[in-house]
């Protein structure tokens, strides 16, 4: 056979579906790697074709359009299962061709099962929820051409295990769930199924996301350093360990970055010669504000190291912060034998 | 005692402004609640002009109406609505109502309301 | 926006009698209604809340059902402190959030 442009197997589009429930997969070359659409493709006499690998084989076959009910069919650049199975799961490719030109992509298929609380193996999807914010919603999502507009699909909302009704401050608007006050205690997987009516037969999608309740960007500030701060002197003798904690408080902001970093001199401690090592680590509040903490360490500090200026730093999208840490030499105390007793004018 | 009591109506030319206050008494405004303004022109019905979100966010929803002529605010107890342009049709008793957002969205407290006339 | 539209605008009705009010939305407002009393001179009165559960302090007479677009107040009894302005107000709160009143139904002495 001819040369085939052979995009492989795609993992980053791993697709998931729920068994016994209708899937519509669209074929990635034309999101993903094609620059023309499949109407462009079709009126240029290319031609689809779809074929699959079964889980654990490695034998590519065609996919049977000719099931009963027709449980698997191709639309446009579209794969419909009507509904899925469970050994549906395997690799898929698409191939747009002709005499001239291929071009060739296969993605993996992964049908899922779930329980009644609708717990599964899926990948779930997030949607953060501002805290105390006003009105805000999510949407049940991937729903969109399943049923034409003329059908009226029944929307059912829950939460965890519990069908949403009656629910206070969580009110469920069909493909919408509105909340009119989203709470930490609301923080929790929503699952929206969606039952429409085709030829006869009646078809279930299950959604479920995870909805995270996180600070208010009203509430936000920017970055606060705790550390260092001007109540600790860090007062060490040439030899010891000089250990400073940055501790910087970041807001949580949708979509920014956090940055703590350290500046000795003026230089960042990969510019200089002094051996240095700083370590980090991360925490987060229930609302996702995070606190971050770099420790500074230089392991045996010279008399040099103890005249320089080390400051912290930190950014976010709500501004940049400096502060410098207070380092000083230790003045030696007196020893007391001959000193003292000089004082007192012994011989 | 729970409640709301209103301020600030008066007689005022058209295209006059005019700023009505509502004091909560008995509560104090959180996230809970939403504070709204709704007004009754003379022997008609309801209308509702606008809320505003109690808690930190201070979130607005506006009748498509009020938009860009009315306008809600609040501090710690106090309710807002300051009414630009003002035309003859405002005339209206305007009454400020505390709403649950923890109780489905009740309107569970009203103000006994205030009056507005706006005439030459 | 949303309409809200109440009948009727007004009816005659005896004590003891069953009264039923209806109210349509111009759109689905999934059972984000609510029905108030309103006597002359005096602040709206809430009855009922998210379509049929009955605020604090409301005699069980009161009751109200439906959903989607329709939705009913009933008074199964009508007593002589029931004679008033009746109001239903709808809430949407996906899209642009917004409230809207019925026109109103009187209920005066047959």
């Known amino acids: 056979s001819e040369r085939c442009d052979d995009w492989g197997l795609d993992t980053m589009r791993q697709i998931q579906v729920f068994e016994d429930e209708p899937a519509r997969i669209k074929c990635p070359l034309f999101e993903h790697f094609l620059k023309f659409n499949y109407s462009t493709a079709h009126s240029a006499g290319l031609t689809l074709i779809w074929y699959w690998t079964r889980q654990d084989r490695d034998l590519e076959e065609p996919i049977n359009f000719r099931l009963p009910e027709n449980r698997i069919s191709k639309e446009k650049d579209v794969l419909w299962f009507r509904p899925t199975l469970l050994n549906d799961t395997g690799n898929y490719t698409c191939m747009l061709r002709n005499t001239t030109y291929c071009s060739k992509v296969a993605f993996p298929l992964e049908v899922v099962q779930k329980d009644s609380c609708f717990n599964s193996p899926m990948k779930l999807p997030v949607h953060k929820l501002y805290i105390e914010y006003g009105i805000q919603r999510i949407t049940c999502p991937n729903v969109d051409g399943y049923f034409p507009s003329s059908v009226k699909p029944t929307i059912t909302w829950y939460m965890g295990c519990y069908k949403i009704q009656n629910f206070n401050n969580v009110i469920p608007e069909g493909m919408n769930l509105s909340f009119l006050i989203a709470l930490i205690s609301n923080n929790g997987n929503y699952t929206c199924v969606v039952t429409y009516p085709e030829n006869g037969r009646t078809f279930h999608l299950t959604r479920t996301l995870t909805v995270k309740v996180v600070g208010s960007p009203k509430n936000a500030v920017p970055p606060v350093i705790h550390s260092p701060n001007d109540h600790v002197v860090y007062e060490k003798e040439p030899g010891e360990e000089l250990l400073i904690p940055c501790t910087v408080y970041f807001s949580f902001l949708m979509d920014s970055r956090n940055e703590v970093w350290w500046t000795i001199d003026g230089k960042k401690p990969d510019d200089i010669t002094i051996d240095v090592t700083i370590n980090e680590s991360i925490s987060h509040s229930r609302t996702e504000d995070e606190t971050r903490t770099q420790i500074l360490s230089i392991k045996k500090v010279t008399s040099e190291d103890l005249k320089r200026s080390y400051v912290c730093h930190a950014r976010s999208a709500k501004g940049e912060v400096a502060k410098a840490a207070k380092v000083k030499q230790k003045v030696p105390a007196p020893r007391y034998t001959v000193e003292l007793a000089c004082g007192f004018g012994a011989t | 005692q729970v409640q709301l009591q209103e301020s600030g109506g008066d007689l005022v030319q058209p295209g006059a402004s005019l700023r009505l206050s509502c004091a909560a008494s008995?509560?104090?405004?959180?996230?809970?609640?939403?504070m709204c303004w709704v007004r009754q022109a003379p022997g008609k019905g309801l209308e509702w002009v606008a809320c505003?979100?109690?808690?930190?966010?201070?979130s607005t929803y506006y009748a498509s109406w009020a938009k860009g002529r009315f306008t809600i605010s609040k501090n710690s107890s106090t309710l807002y609505l300051q009414m630009n342009s003002l035309r003859a049709e405002d005339t209206a008793v305007y009454f400020c109502?505390?709403?649950?957002?923890?109780?489905?969205?009740?309107?569970?407290?009203w103000g006994q309301g205030t009056l507005v006339t706006v005439s030459s | 926006a949303i309409q809200m539209t109440q009948s009727p605008s007004s009816l005659s009705a005896s004590v003891g009698d069953r009264v039923t009010i209806t109210c349509q939305a111009s759109?689905?407002?999934?059972?984000?209604l609510a029905w108030y009393q309103q006597k002359p001179g005096q602040a709206p009165k809430l009855l009922i809340y998210?379509?049929?559960l009955l605020a604090s302090g409301v005699p069980s007479r009161f009751s109200g059902s439906g959903s989607g677009t329709d939705y009913t107040l009933t008074i199964s009894s009508l007593q002589p402190e029931d004679f008033a302005t009746y109001y239903c107000?709808?809430?949407?709160?996906?899209?642009?959030?917004?409230?809207?009143f019925g026109q109103g139904t009187k209920v005066v002495i047959k």
């Open positions: 109502a505390r709403v649950d957002g923890s109780s489905s969205g009740s309107w569970d407290l």
């Open positions: 008995g509560f104090s405004f959180s996230s809970t609640y939403y």
């Open positions: 505003i979100y109690a808690g930190s966010s201070g």
């Open positions: 759109q689905n407002i999934y059972s984000n």
């Open positions: 998210a379509a049929s």
């Open positions: 107000q709808g809430a949407v709160y996906s899209g642009n959030t917004e409230w809207a």
